[in-house]
């Protein structure tokens, strides 16, 4: 059988190294050897591939080496496959070396900010030594912030007369570390060089970008003062490296700027004690280069009726995210504040908050929340300076079986009945939403019975027991992940009811 016709011929010119062609099929059933015929010097000369017999057999690749590689040039390539039965030739393929030239990557030697020019980095590199001198090179510059996985790209060309191998990358974030890598290719080539070694540079620092500001309103104290916990953080989109030297806060009752009070702090939280009126609060951050724009918050009067517009809320889990969605009756509300914190018996140690705009959903990566912990999630509608009533829900990113089962006791033991009472498992040990409780009970040497009840039931009366019999019993609390048994208790049914016994005695 003749060999298969060589097809899918693909050639690449590694500048000043070799000209290599590959083809299919890569393997033949019987021993096959290949001859690659080339014309070069614009068709003036011809030769065959100089691969020796030891590597040519069943090897669908061949390289032509200097000095017969001339550039610029047009080549033709034809592959002949031969076995014991004969020869099969490929079609003749045509190759313009400029279009298939691959060169070495450039070498970035500096990425620096230019004094006084904001949000810009100047990249300087060395043009690859192995690149045609007269060639215009095209470049792709890839860059990303140091903590991001997402690369951005910019393309540009440099004429061969441009000995100045520099590029000014603008519209960056201030005071941010960027990773850069560069590749190049002759302008006409379809093959890019590899990427250069990565180099890091940092843009110049600026005055702080801005703040996101929020509050937690606490119940009024006996003297009528209201504690308001203010909290702020770098605005979304602020440079990662941005550091504030401090924060200035000023606040006053609405329409009474004479009563302005100011506070300076280096913390990102501050507790104010306000009267019952409406207050306005302002916060700026500052560094050695200046102040951020002002963040503003209106604290409503104690008796102010807040609007309500969230009608429903759902929390659902995807593979790696928790997604909270809500429905609103107010189409004009397009900003929302989301709060989340662990639902623990004590004061929550971690309290988080985030603004959401132009969406009615909020997403958080599961790994930002602790598994087996219940989180309280509240969403506040924000309409201009007014904050509406929150809507709250609870969620686990991962449920487990409870760490402990319910503590159980047997009450009102009768001849054939008993009332079982158990306590709710402490929040810290639930590890999930308690779906139901199952009571397992068994007479001495008898069959085990079970009864499952809803999670809102903490007491159950067992009936149809056998008189004067020892029973063992335990209650299991179950989450979606499974159940955990409480401690086993024992009781013995009476031989005669207390009620009957007293009646008899009375006579």
């Amino acid at each position: 059988v003749l060999p298969a016709k060589p097809e899918n011929i693909s050639c690449i010119f590694y500048y000043e190294e070799n000209f290599t062609c590959t083809w299919s099929p890569e393997k033949e059933a019987s021993y096959t050897w290949y001859k690659v015929k080339r014309t070069y010097s614009y068709g003036y000369k011809s030769d065959i591939c100089s691969t020796d017999n030891s590597t040519r057999g069943n090897h669908a690749s061949c390289s032509f080496l200097p000095p017969t590689i001339t550039n610029p040039d047009n080549y033709t390539i034809q592959v002949e496959a031969q076995n014991a039965d004969g020869i099969m030739k490929s079609d003749i393929t045509y190759w313009n070396l400029d279009a298939i030239m691959k060169i070495e990557p450039p070498e970035i030697f500096s990425v620096k900010s230019v004094l006084g020019i904001k949000r810009m980095l100047q990249i300087k590199w060395i043009r690859p030594v192995l690149a045609p001198h007269s060639s215009t090179l095209k470049y792709t510059l890839r860059f990303r912030t140091i903590n991001s996985a997402y690369w951005m790209e910019v393309n540009f060309t440099k004429e061969d007369i441009d000995r100045d191998e520099t590029y000014n990358l603008t519209e960056l974030q201030a005071f941010t570390e960027y990773v850069m890598t560069l590749r190049c290719a002759p302008a006409e080539s379809m093959f890019w060089s590899g990427w250069s070694q990565e180099k890091v540079g940092t843009t110049e620092e600026e005055a702080p970008y801005g703040l996101d500001l929020w509050r937690v309103l606490k119940p009024a104290m006996v003297d009528g003062r209201r504690p308001v916990q203010l909290m702020w953080k770098k605005a979304t989109g602020a440079p990662v490296l941005e550091k504030a030297l401090g924060y200035n806060i000023w606040y006053f009752p609405e329409n009474n700027t004479n009563l302005t009070e100011t506070v300076n702090t280096t913390n990102q939280t501050h507790e104010l004690y306000l009267g019952g009126k409406t207050y306005w609060v302002y916060v700026v951050s500052y560094n050695s280069l200046g102040e951020s724009p002002v963040a503003t918050l209106r604290i409503p009067a104690l008796n102010e009726k807040t609007f309500q517009c969230i009608e429903a809320m759902q929390a659902c889990l995807t593979q790696d995210q928790l997604v909270v969605e809500w429905q609103s009756s107010a189409p004009e509300v397009d900003t929302w504040m989301v709060e989340w914190f662990p639902d623990v018996d004590s004061e929550p140690s971690s309290f988080s908050w985030e603004s959401v705009s132009q969406a009615r959903n909020w997403t958080i990566q599961k790994d930002e929340l602790k598994p087996l912990w219940c989180y309280n999630i509240s969403v506040y509608p924000v309409l201009r300076d007014r904050v509406g009533q929150p809507y709250s829900t609870q969620a686990y990113v991962q449920e487990g079986i409870p760490s402990a089962g319910p503590v159980t006791q047997a009450d009102s033991i009768g001849v054939k009945t008993v009332t079982i009472t158990w306590k709710e498992i402490p929040k810290s040990k639930r590890n999930g939403f308690i779906k139901n409780y199952t009571i397992f009970y068994q007479a001495e040497d008898g069959k085990e019975f079970s009864k499952t009840v809803n999670s809102n039931i903490l007491q159950y009366r067992l009936e149809s027991l056998t008189r004067r019999t020892s029973y063992s019993l335990q209650v299991m609390a179950s989450t979606n992940a499974g159940g955990t048994n409480g401690t086993k208790i024992n009781f013995k049914t009476l031989s005669i009811s207390h009620h009957h016994h007293h009646h008899h005695h009375h006579h």
Partner: antibody
Framework: EVQLVESGGGLVQPGRSMKLSCVAS????????MAWVRQAPTKGLEWVAS????????YYRDSVKGRFTISRDNAKSTLYLQMDSLRSEDTATYYC??????????WGQGVMVTVS | QFTLTQPKSVSGSLRSTITIPCERS????????VSWYQQHLGRPPINVIY?????PSEVSDRFSGSIDSSSNSASLTITNLQMDDEADYFC???????????FGGGTKLTVL
């Protein structure tokens, strides 16, 4: 339409010089290798000389090396053959030919050179 | 340096098939391409086969080329001979030793 038109031939005495020209049209002259091929009366074709696209590389058959010079003017789309120290065995029709990718794809009508 | 040897003449009757061989004196015939040219009296040559067996689009499919490594020769075959096929035929290849093209001596084809 591709055209190659030779000129400059005629009768010349042995030992003297002659310069042939070939004006090309209908294609981008600077993209192609060019050649001179001759044919003595009633004889076969014989390659004389070739020149690369930019003129940097020239190639000659042994019998004319040192006597003949092939050159080109890409601005004028013209190929030249300067023939010095002519011999009687150089008598032939001289064809200007274009090297295509795999063969001589266009030929001029030829110009007669008689060395006598 | 190699030579390409062709028979001085070949003849064939009208509508018959003829084959003109072109033998390479040294080196593998398959290592460089062979082209064939037809030349009518007083006219410049025209290419009829290139790259061993390829035919320019304007040339009749009665013309075909082949390579035979066992005899180290190329062949031009013309089927269904026509009167207009009467001409001189030259094979040509590239010789890396002289860094230039080499022509065979030519074969005169007579159509009877």
């Amino acid at each position: 339409e591709v055209q190659l038109v030779e000129s400059g031939g005629g009768l010349v005495q042995p030992g003297r010089s002659m310069k042939l020209s070939c004006v090309a049209s209908g294609f981008t002259f600077s993209n192609y290798y060019m050649a001179w091929v001759r044919q003595a009366p009633t004889k076969g074709l014989e390659w004389v000389a070739s020149i690369s696209t930019g003129g940097g590389n020239t190639y000659y058959r042994d019998s004319v090396k040192g006597r003949f010079t092939i050159s080109r003017d890409n601005a004028k789309s013209t190929l030249y053959l300067q023939m010095d120290s002519l011999r009687s065995e150089d008598t032939a029709t001289y064809y200007c030919a274009r090297h295509g990718t795999l063969y001589f794809d266009y030929w001029g009508q030829g110009v007669m050179v008689t060395v006598s | 340096q190699f030579t390409l040897t062709q028979p001085k003449s070949v003849s064939g009757s009208l509508r018959s098939t003829i084959t003109i061989p072109c033998e390479r004196s040294s080196g593998d015939i398959g290592n460089t391409y062979v082209s064939w040219y037809q030349q009518h009296l007083g006219r410049p040559p025209i290419n009829v086969i290139y790259a061993d067996d390829q035919r320019p689009s304007e040339v009749s499919d009665r013309f075909s080329g082949s390579i035979d490594s066992s005899s180290n020769s190329a062949s031009l075959t013309i089927t269904n001979l026509q009167m207009d096929d009467e001409a001189d035929y030259f094979c040509q290849s590239y010789d890396s030793n002289i860094d230039g093209p080499v022509f065979g001596g030519g074969t005169k084809l007579t159509v009877l």
